[in-house]
Interface confidence: low
């Protein structure tokens, strides 16, 4: 999916009052500086396509994210603020109905919901400018 | 647990300038923005500008272009800024404050105990 | 820049009443944040994003608003929450409100 022609304003204010709580009530217990941050993104839509990346496919050792509060919140402001994300999603969403597995907080997801954090992060502040 | 810690009081002359610090610790030095606040003795907050230790990016309040600049160490996890051409009007506490943008939008939550700059001859 | 302006500078009030001290922005701004600050220290965050209260802010404060008018309220003023509070927008740059001065009788 190209992210490009999204509306960033309202995904910023939904990630603001309420995906961002969720990803750090996920986090509770975690030391900010456990994990370092090894995926970045350069632009907007670049950003959501990594958090889109990371939030819904699994990933060896973290399989379980995509029915997390923050994955469902997200999943929502993708759908309501990008044209035609939601189409695209319904093959992958009965794809993952079918295999829903038990639901296991291991470090690894630890590890990748704090690289979504960052890449939030950069998503709501695009870099200044070097002057 | 954050601190932010900065430099000590300064006296200086007109004309001069000055350099303060601001060590972080506690957390990641890069993750996070760190602004600069001016406070003149019994009046309001001023914020002077912004920088990223990601990478080195500033902004600042047109008023204070020229006047401040905002350099950061990331070996060091220290921020810094100087002030040139120092004049009476200069003389404030300053403070360093770091900007945390994963927290209900973007607010200076943590603060250092502020550096107090003296100008006079 | 955006302007912001508080009103009253000074507010003058008695252990358990209601008090409310507003911010207005010369343009509209998406969230205000809200400081407090005691003589001699540094200002703390004391509600974020309009209405979230910081960490250990007494349940008894709370904040609202949108666009240009922003206000913070005290359901019943208590004597440590005599103080300078401060509005913070962060839409277009960063700018403080000249602060209120909340004094208890």
């Known amino acids: 999916y190209d992210f490009t022609n999204c509306d960033f304003e309202k995904i910023k204010a939904a990630y603001l009052s309420t995906i961002s709580k969720d990803l750090i009530t996920y986090m509770s217990g975690t030391k900010s500086t456990e994990f370092n941050n090894t995926v970045s993104c350069s632009n907007r839509p670049h950003c959501l396509t990594e958090i889109q990346s990371l939030t819904f496919n699994p990933t060896a050792g973290c399989a379980s994210l995509a029915k997390e509060m923050f994955a469902m919140k997200t999943k929502a402001a993708l759908a309501i603020w990008c044209p035609g994300y939601s189409e695209t999603q319904i093959n992958a969403t009965q794809a993952m109905k079918k295999r829903r597995k038990r639901k296991v907080t291991t470090n690894k997801c630890l590890e990748q919901v704090s690289q979504l954090q960052g890449l939030w992060r950069r998503f709501n502040r695009p870099l200044l400018k070097q002057q | 647990e954050v601190q932010l810690q900065q430099s000590g009081p300064v006296l200086v002359k007109p004309g001069a300038s000055v350099k303060m610090s601001c060590k972080a610790s506690?957390?990641?030095?890069?993750?996070?923005?760190m602004n600069w606040v001016k406070q003149s003795h019994g009046k309001s907050l001023e914020w002077i500008g912004i920088i990223s230790p990601y990478n080195g990016g500033t902004s600042y309040n047109q008023k204070f272009k020229g006047k401040a600049t905002l350099t950061v160490d990331k070996s060091s996890s220290t921020a810094y800024m100087e002030l040139n051409s120092l004049t009476s009007e200069d003389s404030a506490v300053y403070y360093c404050a770091r900007e945390d943008y994963d927290y209900d939008g973007y607010a200076m939550d943590h603060w250092g105990q502020g550096t107090s700059v003296t100008v006079s001859s | 820049q955006i302007v912001l302006s508080q009103s009253p500078a000074i507010l003058s009030a008695s252990p358990g009443e209601k008090v409310t001290m507003t911010c207005r922005a010369s343009s509209s701004v998406s969230y205000m944040h809200w400081y407090q600050q005691k003589p001699g220290s540094s200002p703390k965050p004391w509600i974020y994003?309009?209405?979230n209260l910081a960490s250990g802010v007494p349940a008894r404060f709370s904040g609202s608003g949108s666009g240009t008018s922003y206000s913070l309220t005290i359901s019943r003023v208590e004597a440590e929450d005599a103080a300078t509070y401060y509005c913070?927008?962060?839409?277009?740059?960063?700018?403080f409100g000249g602060g209120t001065k909340l004094e208890i009788k």
């Open positions: 994003a309009t209405s």
């Open positions: 913070q927008q962060w839409s277009s740059n960063r700018t």
């Open positions: 506690g957390y990641t030095f890069t993750d996070d923005y």
